[in-house]
């Protein structure tokens, strides 16, 4: 969490941002809040990116002002216009690209004063893994697949029964480049699995950590998966 304070002339206002991660090829949110003003026409929001000449986005007098917007962001940004009045300056970014990573500044002017805060935005790819029994294999085998990851993640298998066991000798992981030549499909196979056990396939890079669980019994198969973003901190 980064909390910034305004300086100079007028009073300073508190601006708060949260470091976050964007998933390549999806929409992302750059979070920023500020002390609200009672009059929308008095609020100016400017989003800037370190190393980029033009603006990322500007909102003033109750509407977008994009004449100074940098080429790399055109047609891809929007604030939540109906929420600006309550102090939400968050930016929606369409079709996140790898090159969108960097340091952003959320700069606010209201009738109460000015303030800004920086935000670290990471970009990569992350997706939920799905674990299935591989019936084509000669022995009892599990197959963990996740369609989109970047940078290349690590894959670790774990089991509820054999806690702490190292499955690297009985598993095989491959990474296949996707058609856009950035993200990769992750496939990991675990051999010699036993029945009545819960296995977990854990995929992790510096942006996200995802886990796919599968419980195989005589009568049924239960699956569960979850994904968590790493290093989301407020500023």
């Amino acid at each position: 969490l980064i909390i910034g304070f305004g300086i100079s002339g007028r009073h300073s206002i508190t601006v708060t941002t949260v470091a976050s991660a964007g998933n390549i090829g999806e929409d992302g949110i750059l979070s920023c809040t500020f002390e609200p003003d009672i009059k929308l026409s008095d609020i100016v929001i400017q989003w800037l990116k370190e190393g980029v000449l033009g603006l990322v986005h500007e909102f003033k007098e109750g509407k977008d002002e994009l004449s100074e917007q940098d080429e790399m962001f055109r047609g891809r940004t929007a604030v939540f216009a109906d929420q600006v009045i309550v102090g939400n300056a968050s930016l929606r970014l369409k079709n996140v690209q790898l090159t969108d990573a960097g340091t952003y500044k959320c700069y606010i002017i209201t009738s109460k004063g000015k303030g800004n805060a920086n935000l670290e935005y990471k970009t990569g790819a992350f997706s939920m893994p799905e674990v299935n029994v591989d019936y084509n294999a000669s022995s009892e085998t599990l197959r963990c697949e996740a369609p989109r990851w970047f940078p290349q993640p690590t894959v670790v298998w774990a089991s509820q029964v054999d806690q702490g066991a190292n499955f690297s000798e009985v598993s095989n992981t491959s990474f296949e480049l996707n058609s856009e030549n950035v993200t990769m499909k992750v496939v990991s196979v675990l051999y010699n699995v036993t029945i009545n056990n819960t296995y977990s396939c854990m995929i992790e890079n510096d942006i996200a950590k995802a886990t796919g669980d599968i419980k195989v019994t005589e009568s049924e198969i239960k699956r569960r998966s979850h994904l968590q973003l790493l290093n989301s901190k407020a500023s």
């Epitope: 004449s67 055109r74 079709n95």
Partner: antibody, heavy 120, light 107 residues
């Protein structure tokens, strides 16, 4: 050659539901945002919704929000529009469109369209 | 939402004429303005992107200009096959809006 072929249109009663499909070919479907755009009987064009390349992000026009759901199956190169609580004003030709690759919010390819009529 | 207003609603022309079609946005949209052509019984096709950028495969007689809230599509020597409806589209925000169209017909 880029091809977008819509299907699933028809006559539905007010309050009813229908699902439109769009089969895409001739390009790497999973790399592109896709949108539905409709054209009313008066020939007005109205953007309906978009879905991101991976399918995880969607955005809707106010007129259909909460009633329509856009989705995609990249394994099948197919775009969908599930429509429910249909109203007579949803009557239109529905076009499947491909958005420009990385920026711009414009539509570089359009399908031939499929017609939805909402009437009792 | 941004409202796009096109004029005239109908334009009657003679082959060889130079014509201008107007599109006005209810607020400034910089150059985030795209043009489409729709011929009878066909789907729309992209003509011009970002107010003035040409599209591969589109004849050079089509050109666009303008910035802010006023835009123009020009056809410098109309051909009979240019008959149809021309739409402008705001590409500036996530909620995309189209003009009502200008119908180009032969006298």
């Amino acid at each position: 050659e880029v091809q977008l072929v819509e299907s699933g249109g028809g006559l539905v009663q007010p309050g009813g539901s229908l699902k439109l499909s769009c089969a895409a070919s001739g390009f790497t479907f999973s790399n592109y945002y896709m949108s539905w755009v409709r054209q009313t009987p008066e020939k007005r064009l109205e953007w309906v919704a978009y879905v991101s390349s991976g399918g995880g992000s969607t955005y809707y026009s106010d007129s259909v929000k909460g009633r329509f759901t856009i989705s995609r199956d990249n394994a099948k190169n197919t775009l969908y529009l599930q429509m429910s609580s249909l109203k007579p004003e949803d009557t239109a030709m529905y076009y499947c469109t491909r958005e420009s690759y990385s920026q711009g919010n414009y539509f570089d390819y359009w399908g031939q369209g499929t017609t939805l009529t909402v009437s009792s | 939402d941004i409202v796009m207003t096109q004029s005239p609603a109908t334009l009657s022309v003679t082959p060889g004429d130079r014509v201008s079609l107007s599109c006005r946005a209810s607020q400034s949209i910089s150059d985030y303005l795209h043009w489409y052509q729709q011929k009878s019984h066909e789907s729309p096709r992209l003509l011009i992107k970002f107010a003035s950028q040409s599209i591969s495969g589109i004849p050079s007689r089509f050109s666009g200009s303008g910035s802010g809230s006023d835009f123009t599509l020009s056809i410098n020597s109309v051909e009979p096959e240019d008959v149809g409806v021309y739409y402008c589209q705001n590409g500036h925000s996530f909620s995309l809006t189209f003009g009502a169209g200008t119908k180009l017909e032969l006298k």
